[in-house]
């Protein structure tokens, strides 16, 4: 059924043209989970190609994916979430290539949202806060977040801070005065579940104030 060679030295005899990758999202719609797969080569002719998942499912042996443009998609409550599933690309009922995947190892969290930055004049710092839908979830509750910020004029000079909470303080003295900054955040699973970074949140832009000199202090 799997369509791949069982022999050790033939294990990579699958058709490379059909290599694909997938990610899962747990409780993405209420208690429904999703699984999204796509071919790594965007030029693959996907006409007549189907995806199917078998094994590690509740009550059913296999499920077929829906096709949405160039991606393949399942939304279901039927993932057992323990054990490996066999995900196959099929044409006319025949498997072209398959992968054994544990869906708990390919989790992609939802992007954080409501990112904002508030300047505290007295403390001379910036409080960064954001929200994540995962605080309400029952499975992927523990995340590591990556906050990235840059001065808008420095195209590729991103600074990164990793944190497990949804609040971060940036000290004013570590930022350039009177500058426009862009900041964004993404998340990755961080307890039992493994997988990929979420999409970035929408960026937030903030301006740092000019330096307030203390009385009697001269400008350089």
């Amino acid at each position: 059924e799997s369509g791949y060679a069982q022999n050790g030295d033939l294990e990579d005899a699958e058709l490379d043209d059909y290599s694909f990758s997938c990610y899962s999202q747990l409780e993405v719609n209420g208690s429904q989970h999703s699984l999204t797969c796509a071919f790594e080569d965007p030029d693959v002719n996907t006409t007549n190609l189907e995806f199917e998942i078998c094994g590690a499912l509740v009550e059913v042996k296999c499920l077929s994916f829906r096709k949405l443009q160039e991606i393949y998609f399942i939304e279901t409550k039927k993932f057992l979430l323990i054990g490996k599933s066999n995900i196959c690309v099929k044409v006319g009922g025949k498997s072209l290539t398959c992968k054994k995947i544990d869906l708990t190892t390919i989790v992609k969290p939802e992007a954080p949202f409501d990112l904002s930055v508030i300047y505290r004049e007295g403390a001379n710092d910036f409080v960064v806060t954001f929200n994540t839908s995962h605080l309400q979830k029952k499975y992927v509750k523990v995340l590591m977040h990556d906050v990235a910020y840059r001065q808008e004029k420095d195209e590729n000079k991103w600074m990164h801070v990793n944190l497990s909470s949804t609040k971060l303080t940036l000290l004013q003295r570590n930022l350039q005065p009177e500058a426009m900054y862009e900041i964004k955040v993404r998340s990755i699973p961080d307890h039992y579940f493994k997988g990929f970074w979420s999409e970035w949140s929408p960026s937030y832009y903030f301006r740092t104030p000019e330096i307030n000199n203390s009385p009697g202090e001269m400008d350089p």
Partner: antibody, heavy 118, light 111 residues
């Protein structure tokens, strides 16, 4: 059928090293992680570590770090466990086991007895 | 490390009677409905054999007189009608956190 076949019993002197092999057959070698579990005489089971044959990535029980080295050879569908600086307490049956999921063991080798004695 | 405590240490049950083995963990091994507890049977001179994974899922080929239940820190393996071939040592194992630990074992005998 799915099988894990381990190398034969070994008798070693204290301070020596031993390398135990586990050959997989009946399934695609890179689809499943392989782990090692030991059982001292009359004792329970102790997870030592595991290896992902696809990537060569390893995970070790902290207790066995520096003592155990896991490797794999995709060309022969074989994983190896090397035990170094052997002591009498290392006398045990060593099992390789396939991980059917994270991390339970659905297929086991027959076991390899390692005896450490002067 | 998560400590798994099995009870009883040994159990003598008449043929056809129910055998119940408990496994208690030092911390939760559940994430919502995902229960990372597994059960094995080991007969003398043989490797362990997987019976139940994920607390309650029967491994393929295992007789349905074996069943598992439980969540969080308390789990149970039940043999509904003990057969002579069920004489063995039974182990629980958790896989929520490295190192993946086993219980000390419960020896099941015929009364």
């Amino acid at each position: 059928q799915v099988q894990l076949v381990q190398s034969g019993a070994e008798v070693k002197k204290p301070g020596a090293s031993v390398k135990v092999s586990c050959k997989a057959s009946g399934y695609r070698f890179t689809d499943y992680e392989l782990h090692w579990v030991r059982q001292a005489p009359g004792q329970g089971l102790e997870w030592m570590g595991g290896i992902d044959p696809k990537t060569g990535g390893t995970a070790y029980n902290q207790k066995f770090k520096g003592k155990v080295t896991l490797t794999s050879d995709r060309s022969t569908s074989t994983v190896y466990m090397e035990l170094s600086s052997l002591r009498s307490e290392d006398t045990a049956v060593y099992y390789c086991a396939r991980s059917g999921g994270r991390w339970y063991f659905d297929v086991w080798g027959q076991g390899t007895t390692v005896t450490v004695s002067s | 490390d998560i400590v798994l405590t099995q009870s009883p240490d040994s159990l003598a049950v008449s043929l056809g009677e129910r055998a119940t083995i408990n496994c208690r963990t030092s911390e939760s091994v559940s994430i919502h409905l995902l229960h990372l507890m597994h059960w094995y049977q080991q007969k003398p001179g043989q490797p362990p054999k997987l019976l139940i994974y994920g607390a309650s899922n029967l491994e393929s080929g295992v007789p349905d007189r074996f069943s598992g239940s439980g969540s969080e820190t308390d789990f149970t393996l039940t043999i509904s009608s003990l057969q002579a071939e069920d004489v063995a040592v039974y182990y629980c194992q958790q896989s929520i956190k490295d190192p993946y630990t086993f219980g000390g074992g419960t020896k099941v005998e015929i009364k």
